[in-house]
């Protein structure tokens, strides 16, 4: 079996941890976000070839099927396997608070 | 803000349960299972239009900056929110024996 | 909830090194934006900002006293220490240990008072 | 450095009057203050954040203000717990305080 990290496509082609730079305004968070003004956001980002990153036996199905009928079954798709928290300083409808977001900003990926 | 369950694209065009029907070689597996013959594979199949069954905060941010730069982020992915355990019965080199997978069949999705 | 809790040596001689522990819990600090920093309050007089830690490990020093500051954490993350050396009488004060959300200083711990003297 | 100048140094005020503390910058620093209140005996406790955002519990009597150089705290109605020394901090770059405002009873 093909090393489930080394990429077939070349380098940087698959799967991976993408980190892409964002305003308030590009993530709509303008009217109800204080702090950060900008954010590093970590995201998945990458093709899924075979056996690549696969994170479970449903990812080893769904590829299987995928090749033998790529029209109906789609390719495994890059995912986060885990998340980094992010804590926000919110307007709220008497000022500002404080809160914590466990789903924000992709740690890992995984195919799925 | 559009209902999360609600397709903008027509009817069956999200992202949303599929059932396919493989046979062990369809999956590969006639080398090493004997049961079941068949599978009912269940998977997420579909589209991931803006706030359609939105995983959590990270799809959309996603789905924000996939509208900003659609060149370098993708949209969201339909990809299992939970799975259906099934049981397999493994040839071994002795015999056979029972192994319940967790992760196997997709029992319902969002868009991550 | 948030508490932060200082804890020093109360008196300290002149010239010595000052080593301060914050001892933190309601927050972590590998969550992106949590900072834990040091304030200090000289008796009957303002407040100076020393030094914060961030979250990626980013540490920033009040320029005047940089030379003498050192922030670190502990690997268990809920623990900041500062030292402060070549301490002098203008060393006197209460310090105070902050968490940080971005740029906020938004709770403060009680503070822990530090006399230098010989 | 940033300079942050408060004034008035110390006020003297009465239940329910109106007090204003203001808070000159040396340079632009956007909307990037903060306010904090410390009661004699104990620490600082914030205000406002972003010179004019409540931050969570804080009542509805205090309001802040301003942008680029100029910034003003206000109490439109003074309570006996609000006697207390009142710091506007910068954020802008490295963080600098006020020297204080001590409001006191008349």
């Known amino acids: 079996a093909r090393n489930g990290d080394r990429c077939p496509l070349g380098p940087g082609r698959c799967c991976r941890l993408h980190t892409v730079h964002a305003s308030l305004e590009d993530l709509g968070w303008a009217d109800w976000v204080l702090s950060p003004r900008e954010v590093q956001v970590t995201m998945c980002i990458g093709a899924c070839p075979s056996q690549f990153r696969e994170a479970n036996m449903h990812a080893q199905i769904k590829m299987n099927l995928h090749r033998l009928k790529p029209d109906t079954v789609p390719a495994p798709c890059c995912v986060p396997a885990s998340y980094n928290p992010m804590v926000l300083i919110q307007k709220t409808d008497t000022g500002v608070s404080l809160q914590t977001y466990d789903d924000l900003l992709a740690k890992d990926c995984h195919c799925v | 803000a559009r209902n999360g369950d609600r397709c903008p694209l027509g009817p069956g065009r999200c992202c949303r349960l599929h059932t396919v029907h493989a046979s062990l070689e369809d999956l590969g597996w006639a080398d090493w299972v004997l049961s079941p013959r068949e599978v009912q594979v269940t998977m997420c199949i579909g589209a991931c239009p803006s706030q359609f069954r939105e995983a959590n905060m990270h799809a959309q941010i996603k789905m924000n900056l996939h509208r900003l730069k659609p060149d370098t982020v993708p949209a969201p992915c339909c990809v299992p929110a939970s799975y259906n355990p099934m049981v397999l019965i493994q040839k071994t080199d002795t015999g056979v024996s029972l192994q319940t997978y967790d992760d196997l069949l997709a029992k319902d999705c969002h868009c991550v | 909830q948030v508490q932060l809790q200082e804890s020093g040596p109360g008196l300290v001689k002149p010239s010595e090194t000052l080593s301060l522990t914050c001892t933190f819990s309601?927050?972590?600090?590998?969550?992106?934006?949590?900072?834990v920093g040091w304030i200090r309050q000289p008796p009957g007089k303002g407040l100076e900002w020393l030094a914060h830690?961030?979250?990626?490990?980013?540490?920033r020093y009040n320029p005047a006293l940089k030379s003498r500051l050192t922030i670190s954490k502990d690997s268990s993350k809920s623990q900041i220490s500062l030292k402060l050396s070549s301490v002098t009488a203008a060393d006197t004060a209460v310090y105070y240990c902050?968490?940080?959300?971005?740029?906020?200083?938004?709770?403060w711990g009680q503070g822990t008072t530090v006399t230098v003297s010989s | 450095d940033i300079q942050m100048t408060q004034s008035p140094s110390s006020l003297s005020a009465s239940v329910g009057d109106r007090v204003t503390i203001t808070c000159k910058a040396s340079?632009?620093?956007?909307?990037?203050v903060a306010w904090y209140q410390q009661k004699p005996g104990q620490s600082p406790k914030a205000l406002i954040y972003?010179?004019?955002y409540r931050s969570s519990g804080v009542p509805s009597r205090f309001s802040g203000s301003g942008s680029g150089t100029d910034f003003t705290l206000t109490i439109s109605s003074l309570q006996p717990e609000d006697f207390a020394t009142y710091y506007c901090?910068?954020?802008?770059?490295?963080?600098?305080f006020g020297q204080g405002t001590r409001l006191e009873i008349k």
């Open positions: 901090q910068q954020y802008h770059s490295y963080p600098t």
């Open positions: 340079q632009n620093v956007d909307t990037n």
């Open positions: 902050v968490q940080m959300a971005w740029d906020w200083f938004a709770y």
């Open positions: 309601g927050f972590s600090l590998s969550t992106s934006g949590m900072g």
């Open positions: 830690i961030l979250w990626d490990d980013v540490k």
């Open positions: 972003s010179a004019s």
